[in-house]
Interface confidence: medium
Amino acid sequence: EAIQVTQPSVVLASSHGVASFPCEYSPSHNTDEVRVTVLRQTNDQMTEVCATTFTEKNTVGFLDYPFCSGTFNESRVNLTIQGLRAVDTGLYLCKVELMYPPPYFVGMGNGTQIYVIDPEPCPDSD
Amino acid sequence: EAIQVTQPSVVLASSHGVASFPCEYSPSHNTDEVRVTVLRQTNDQMTEVCATTFTEKNTVGFLDYPFCSGTFNESRVNLTIQGLRAVDTGLYLCKVELMYPPPYFVGMGNGTQIYVIDPEPCPDSD
């Protein structure tokens, strides 16, 4: 069954290559395990950036992913992707799966276009 | 059934002849044994470079291969090939098989072109 996932349409990464955005879903039935996956869409190709499972006790996610972090509260996940460079500019989709207990629900946001601008290199000091 | 395997299109080996790249797959259904094979394509010939089976308990792979190493996390394998020389420049494909339990899924990435530049020999010191 499907759930509605919302995320901002555009986010500009900081000069340090960090982009943060919320991913919210509804309806939020009582769920013990929520799996959140961040996917990047390039052309017709979808690649997984990072994924994690949140629980009532485990509200900090993506511990195994150096470039992703996230916190979970009720039906909202605050996502942060770091280490971004200009080549990483693209559409990032948030997928939410209400894993357990049944029934299983899944939903995908329309995507957040993340723009990344590489900083100019510092001039050599004389 | 097929799964989608993604890997970067180009990677430049370090001056020490080491190339690292991720190999990711989706969808990732609950799988206890994931077999990852690295193949090199030269002309129409495909040769196996190394292969390993990852499990939930065994997340470090290619222990029998001196030139390959890899770590496995959820649906991502971080591959490292070392000992590369300029003659090893070529297209390296990542093949993923979700081995067990059934149903079996298999997928092959489009390949990562690894460029290897042999280092310039250091000038003799006088």
Epitope: - | K57, M99, P101, P102, Y104
Partner: antibody, heavy 124, light 107 residues
Framework: EVQLVESGGGLVQPGGSLRLSCAAS????????MHWVRQAPGKGLEWVSA????????YYADSVKGRFTISRDNSKNTLYLQMNSLRAEDTAVYYC?????????????????WGQGTLVTVSS | DIQMTQSPSSLSASVGDRVTITCQAS??????LNWYQQKPGKAPKLLIY???NLETGVPSRFSGSGSGTDFTFTISSLQPEDIATYYC?????????FGQGTKVEIK
Amino acid sequence: EVQLVESGGGLVQPGGSLRLSCAASGFTFSSYVMHWVRQAPGKGLEWVSAITWSGGGTYYADSVKGRFTISRDNSKNTLYLQMNSLRAEDTAVYYCARGRLFGLVRYGEAFDVWGQGTLVTVSS
Amino acid sequence: DIQMTQSPSSLSASVGDRVTITCQASKDISNYLNWYQQKPGKAPKLLIYDASNLETGVPSRFSGSGSGTDFTFTISSLQPEDIATYYCQQFNSFPLTFGQGTKVEIK
């Protein structure tokens, strides 16, 4: 000749323990998923447990979960089933079976080689 | 868990008869179904795998068909050595489950 030979069955009191073994020969044991299937006297077949090639994945029927442990020693070509807290309803012939995976792009699995079975009787 | 329901539970037929056994799954299992033969006092033997594929060395009078939830096992011409109990088994998901069995006897 491809063969599976079970051993370790016998009479045990309720609450007791037993360890079944299954010795494999004639094939590369480590290349196969292995299963235990049981059959109570005069009844049908009941799948009990499975273990993947290296032991990374183990599976159990709800009726034995938490009481039975499947394991394997590939160096000895042997499959094991450690049975604890045995109950009268565990009385059965226990078969070990080889799981053959078939198909190219989609696996199926079938028990293509079976042992002769070993009888476990749980009774006071 | 997926329940497998076999029918009939027993049947009696004459040598040369066509014998049909059905197996119904409680949910769609695609073609993830096997058929086994078990003779008295013996271990089961694989006859049909993946719903319709004949195991090597098994006589061609045995066949299987079906997909989804409804499956059929057929012996085209019953022979005296076919006296046995036949079981279907799903491998769509764990726990793996068998049908309750069909006992085939000769009239």
